[in-house]
C-alpha cells in the first residue's frame, strides 16, 4: 500500500481542504472511525487501484486516525493496512470529544491502561489531574492517543490551556474489579540507569500473609544470580516486599524485569514486570522542532516551550543575545523546567507583555556531565500597524498630492482607495482601489525604511492626483499580520474654495 | 459504606431474556452513574451500559442497543438491567458498579446461563 501524502502525522489548517490518496495492487479502502467515508476509486491502466479521499472545510473534530486498508472480495492474505494520523488545530474545539464507552475503564487486573483524552493541537500541553485534586500527575501523554499508565481506581480530567482559556476534559472513571486475592505491583528507583549506577526493584504484595516471590531478570538467564531480600512493611497490615538490587549495573542489564508471586493455600498467582533501560553513558535529546524563527506580539504575552529527554537530569539555561536570563523579578520574564516523566523535560520561557525590546537570538541549553544539547531561534517581535500622518498638499504643478506615513512589524502593506460620491460611500459604494492601475490618473510612491532601535519597519507612500474635478474622499490602509489601520481624508478640487 | 446486593443466578434458554437486579444501600452518589458491566469466561470485562440514580437517563453501548433496558425503583433504590433475546454468547457474569469519585463500588456479581 502507498499512501499520499506518507504521513505518519499530518497537522492541517482549519477551513482548508486536503486530498489523501491511497493505491495498492487490489482493491483499497479510506476508513475513519470503523466506516468508510465518501472516496473516489478508480483502476489504473496498469491494475494498479487506488482510493481517494477529500477532506473538505477541515475542523478540529476531523482530527484522528485515518486508515488505508485492502477492501478485496477475492481475500487476499494480508492484513496490511497504512495509518495515518491528521492534527487539524482548531482553538474551538477542546477535547475531542468520547463515547461513552471510552469514559468508563473497566479492568480486572492492575495494567496498562489508556485514558483517551485527545486535542486537535499537537503543540498543547496537556496534563492529567484526579478530579478532584489540582496537582498534575506524572504520566506520559501521547497527543494521538492520551495519557498512559497504571491508573488508580480514581475519576480523573484531563487540562489544557488554549490561547488564554483552561479546558477541562469530561471525567474519565476508572473501575477495577479486584478478581484475585493477590494484588502485586512493581516499581524501580530509576527505569533508566548509567552503566556502573545501581538497579533497585521493589516488588510490592498486598493482601497475602505466605506468598512466594519469583524475579526474573536479564542477569538470570546467564545464570548469574541475584539473591532478593524480603522484608514485612510493619506500618501496613500484609504489605510484603521483595527487593532486587543490582549493583554496578551493566549494559546486558537492559532488559524485562517480572515478579512473579505465588500464594499457595488458594493456588492464586499474579506478576507483573517493568522494563529497565542501561545506557553507556547520560543523553540529552530534543524531543520535537521548535522553528528557528519565532513571533509575539508587542504588549501580549508568548510562552516559548522546548521538550527534551535526558538522563541523569540536567541543568536548563536560556541566553539571549549570549547573556544567562534569570526569573526578573519585576515578572517579566519566568522560566521553568518541569519534569513530566521520569527522563521528559517541558522547559518554558515565559515573556510577560513582551516589550520590543525583548527581540532578540534565544538559546536554551540543557546538559549534564555526559552531554548537552541547544536550541536557539530568533524571536521577532510583531508590532501593530498604525497610520501616524496622512495629509494632503497642492503643489505648484496643478497635481494634488496626499501622503500616508505609518509603521510596523512585519513590514505594512499599503492600500490606497478612493470614493468619488462623498454621500454614498463606503456604504453603498465600494470604494476605488488606487495606484495599481496604469492609467494616469493616479502615480504612487512609495518608500520603506526599517528603523534597528524600534525594530520596525516605516512606510511612507505618496499619491499623486493629476485631476481632481469633485471632492474626493481618498482612505490609507496600512496593513500586517498582526492588524490593520485606516486613515481619510478629502481632496477638494483647486477651483472650490479651501474646505 | 455503599453496598451493592445483586439477584441470584439466572439460566435460561436461547431467545429468553434475564432481568438482573443491584441494590443499592449507602447509596448518596446522586449525581453519579450505576454501571453494568459483563464477563464472560476468560474474556475481559465488557461494558454494556449505564443508568443515572433517578432511571430517566441511560445509554447503552452500541452492541447491545435494541437489546437491553435499564431501570431504575427509586423507592427501594434497586437497580435492574434486562437482556432480551439471549444467546449462547450471553453466558457471563453480569456485575452492577458505581464510582464514588475515589474509589468504585462493585456488586457481587450473577452468573447468566444461557443454554439450550
Known amino acids: 500500500l502507498v499512501v499520499t501524502p506518507p504521513g505518519p502525522e499530518l497537522v492541517l489548517n482549519v477551513s482548508s481542504t486536503f486530498v489523501l490518496t491511497c493505491s495498492g495492487s487490489a482493491p483499497v479502502v479510506w476508513e475513519r472511525m470503523s466506516q468508510e467515508p465518501p472516496q473516489e476509486m478508480a483502476k489504473a491502466q496498469d491494475g494498479t487501484f487506488s482510493s481517494v479521499l477529500t477532506l473538505t472545510n477541515l475542523t478540529g473534530l476531523d482530527t484522528g486516525e485515518y486508515f488505508c486498508t485492502h477492501n478485496d472480495s477475492r481475500g487476499l492474505e494480508t492484513d496490511e493496512r497504512k495509518r495515518l494520523y491528521i492534527f487539524v488545530p482548531d482553538p474551538t474545539v477542546g477535547f475531542l470529544p468520547n463515547d461513552a464507552e471510552e469514559l468508563f475503564i473497566f479492568l480486572t487486573e492492575i495494567t496498562e491502561i489508556t485514558i483517551p483524552c485527545r486535542v486537535t493541537d499537537p503543540q498543547l500541553v496537556v496534563t492529567l489531574h484526579e478530579k478532584k485534586g489540582d496537582v498534575a500527575l506524572p504520566v506520559p501523554y501521547d497527543h494521538q492517543r492520551g495519557f498512559s499508565g497504571i491508573f488508580e481506581d480514581r475519576s480523573y480530567i484531563c487540562k489544557t490551556t488554549i490561547g488564554d482559556r483552561e479546558v477541562d476534559s469530561d471525567a474519565y472513571y476508572v473501575y477495577r474489579l479486584q478478581v484475585s486475592s493477590i494484588n502485586v505491583s512493581v516499581n524501580a528507583v530509576q527505569t533508566v540507569v548509567r552503566q556502573g549506577e545501581n538497579i533497585t526493584l521493589m516488588c510490592i504484595v498486598i493482601g497475602n500473609e505466605v506468598v512466594n516471590f519469583e524475579w526474573t531478570y536479564p542477569r538470570k538467564e546467564s545464570g548469574r544470580l541475584v539473591e532478593p531480600v524480603t522484608d514485612f512493611l510493619l506500618d501496613m497490615p500484609y504489605h510484603i516486599r521483595s527487593i532486587l538490587h543490582i549493583p554496578s549495573a551493566e549494559l546486558e542489564d537492559s532488559g524485562t524485569y517480572t515478579c512473579n508471586v505465588t500464594e499457595s493455600v488458594n493456588d492464586h498467582q499474579d506478576e507483573k514486570a517493568i522494563n529497565i533501560t542501561v545506557v553507556e553513558s547520560g543523553y540529552v535529546r530534543l524531543l520535537g522542532e521548535v522553528g528557528t524563527l519565532q513571533f509575539a506580539e508587542l504588549h501580549r504575552s508568548r510562552t516559548l516551550q522546548v521538550v527534551f529527554e535526558a538522563y541523569p537530569p540536567p541543568t536548563v539555561l536560556w541566553f539571549k543575545d549570549n547573556r544567562t536570563l534569570g526569573d526578573s523579578s519585576a515578572g517579566e520574564i519566568a522560566l521553568s523546567t518541569r519534569n513530566v516523566s521520569e527522563t521528559r523535560y517541558v522547559s518554558e520561557l515565559t515573556l510577560v507583555r513582551v516589550k520590543v525590546a525583548e527581540a532578540g537570538h534565544y538559546t536554551m541549553r540543557a546538559f549534564h556531565e555526559d552531554a548537552e544539547v541547544q536550541l536557539s531561534f530568533q524571536l521577532q517581535i510583531n508590532v501593530p500597524v498604525r497610520v501616524l500622518e496622512l495629509s494632503e498638499s497642492h503643489p505648484d504643478s496643478g497635481e494634488q498630492t496626499v501622503r500616508c506615513r505609518g509603521r510596523g512589524m512585519p513590514q505594512p502593506n499599503i492600500i490606497w482607495s478612493a470614493c468619488r460620491d462623498l454621500k454614498r460611500c463606503p456604504r453603498e459604494l465600494p470604494p476605488t482601489l488606487l495606484g495599481n492601475s496604469s492609467e494616469e490618473e493616479s502615480q504612487l510612491e512609495t518608500n520603506v525604511t526599517y528603523w534597528e532601535e524600534e525594530q520596525e519597519f516605516e512606510v511612507v507612500s505618496t499619491l499623486r492626483l493629476q485631476h481632481v474635478d469633485r471632492p474626493l474622499s481618498v482612505r490609507c490602509t496600512l496593513r500586517n499580520a498582526v492588524g490593520q489601520d485606516t486613515q481619510e481624508v478629502i481632496v477638494v478640487p483647486h477651483s472650490l474654495p479651501f474646505k | 459504606q455503599v453496598q451493592l446486593v445483586q439477584s441470584g443466578a439466572e439460566v435460561k434458554k436461547p431467545g429468553a431474556s434475564v432481568k438482573v437486579s443491584c441494590r443499592a444501600s449507602g447509596y448518596t452518589f446522586t449525581n453519579s452513574f450505576m454501571q453494568w458491566v459483563r464477563q464472560v469466561p476468560g474474556q475481559r470485562l465488557e461494558w454494556v451500559g449505564l443508568?443515572?440514580?433517578?432511571?430517566?437517563?441511560?445509554v447503552y453501548a452500541p452492541k447491545f442497543q435494541g437489546r437491553v433496558t435499564m431501570t431504575t425503583d427509586t423507592a427501594t433504590s434497586t437497580f435492574y438491567m434486562e437482556l432480551f433475546s439471549l444467546r449462547s454468547d450471553d453466558t457471563a457474569v453480569y456485575y452492577c458498579a458505581t464510582h464514588g469519585g475515589d474509589r468504585s463500588y462493585w456488586g457481587q456479581g450473577t452468573l447468566v446461563t444461557v443454554s439450550s
Open positions: 443508568s443515572n440514580p433517578s432511571g430517566d437517563y441511560t
